[in-house]
Interface confidence: medium
């Protein structure tokens, strides 16, 4: 089990580092988006794990961005960002087989309502229970 957890961590960290770099290979990214969405978490250890991902970086005040799957839907009543940005992207999390192009990458500023906690502990719990 410890070996499995180490392997999982390696895969996840690599997925985060390479997020969005290859539009033809998105299965791992979409799976990880699904994990974040379902477990209500963001990143492996912390949301800051996403800050190293070049394709998510904006400029200036938008330098820190994370995938939309990090967005805490229950924490906002901003219907504009929900309807126009978040929900259309999150709806695809139910259809993981669908291919995605880099232009479709949904990212939100870290300043918005994103999950506070990394996914490591939740995933490890899930592994222990299955």
């Amino acid at each position: 089990r410890a070996q499995l957890e180490r392997s999982l961590r390696d895969v996840v960290e690599k997925t985060i580092q390479k997020y969005g770099t290859n539009p033809e290979e998105t299965a791992a990214e979409e799976s990880w988006d699904y994990v974040q969405f379902q477990l209500r978490c963001c990143g492996w250890h912390y949301p800051q794990d996403w800050f190293q991902v070049l394709i998510l970086r904006g400029n200036g005040s938008e330098a820190h961005r994370v995938p939309c799957s990090c967005y805490n839907l229950s924490a906002t009543n901003d219907s504009t960002i929900l309807d126009k940005v978040i929900l259309p992207q999150l709806s695809r999390l139910g259809h993981l087989a669908r291919s995605r192009h880099s232009a479709d990458i949904c990212a939100v500023p870290a300043e918005s309502h994103i999950y506070r906690e990394g996914c490591a502990q939740g995933l490890q719990k899930w592994l222990h229970n299955n």
Partner: antibody, heavy 115, light 110 residues
Framework: SVEESGGRLVTPGTPLTLTCTVS????????MNWVRQAPGKGLEWIGI?????RTDYASWAKGRFTISKTSTTVELKITSPTTEDTATYFC?????????????WGPGTLVTVSS | AYDMTQTPSSVEAAVGGTVTIKCQAS??????LAWYQQKPGQPPQLLIH???TLASGVPSRFKGSGSGTQFTLTISGVQSDDAATYYC????????????FGGGTEVVVK
């Protein structure tokens, strides 16, 4: 609401466990922080327990404190108290969203460590 | 390490005057900063979160501003009830931290 209990006079080296009882919200979706305040001093962050049960501690608090939880309580164990641990201990809720602040706070419980 | 430096440690203000308290983070914390008010014998109370958002029930004379590493709490039209100690706290990181709080600023109202 949030309420701490368990504070009392203890002798140095005697382990002490403080309890924070919560109502009106779920520990499954909220993180909880422990903060202390020595008499006449400022606020000092001790650590946090996340919704998943993962914990983080202030660098000075590692090994000196242990945070754990049940479905409705959060515990802070002071493993080997010294006189420097004399303080009022607060627990406070933090939401599940990054950037959430500490609210509400409990009234605090006083720990006095003296021989 | 995300150390928080708060200045001044104490300030006097006249009723109706303005108080400015500054908080500096040692690294960029985006806007993950909160301000608390604490009166003697009471727990801290949340005033402002996300650097500038007023907590529920907090009077509009309290204003938070700033982002990155520099933050300010301004109390305009100071009232005698504002006499308290004010603390800033970073909410950006809990990893390898000495303290998430600033050292506090005592506001004395004349």
């Amino acid at each position: 609401s949030v309420e701490e209990s368990g504070g009392r006079l203890v002798t140095p080296g005697t382990p002490l466990t403080l309890t924070c009882t919560v109502s009106g919200f779920s520990l499954s979706y909220n993180a909880m922080n422990w903060v202390r305040q020595a008499p006449g001093k400022g606020l000092e962050w001790i650590g946090i327990i996340f919704a998943s049960g993962r914990t983080d501690y202030a660098s000075w608090a590692k090994g000196r404190f242990t945070i754990s939880k049940t479905s409705t309580t959060v515990e802070l164990k002071i493993t080997s108290p010294t006189t420097e641990d004399t303080a009022t201990y607060f627990c406070a809720r933090e939401g599940s969203t990054w950037g959430d602040a500490l609210d509400p706070w409990g009234p605090g419980t006083l720990v006095t460590v003296s021989s | 390490a995300y150390d928080m430096t708060q200045t001044p440690s104490s300030v006097e203000a006249a009723v109706g005057g303005t108080v400015t308290i500054k908080c500096q983070a040692s690294q960029n914390i985006i806007d993950y900063l909160a301000w608390y008010q604490q009166k003697p014998g009471q727990p801290p109370q949340l005033l402002i979160h996300k650097a500038s958002t007023l907590a529920s029930g907090v009077p509009s004379r309290f204003k938070g501003s700033g982002s990155g590493t520099q933050f300010t709490l301004t109390i305009s039209g100071v009232q005698s009830d504002d006499a308290a100690t004010y603390y800033c706290q970073q909410g950006y990181s809990n990893s390898n931290i000495d303290n998430t709080f600033g050292g506090g600023t005592e506001v004395v109202v004349k």
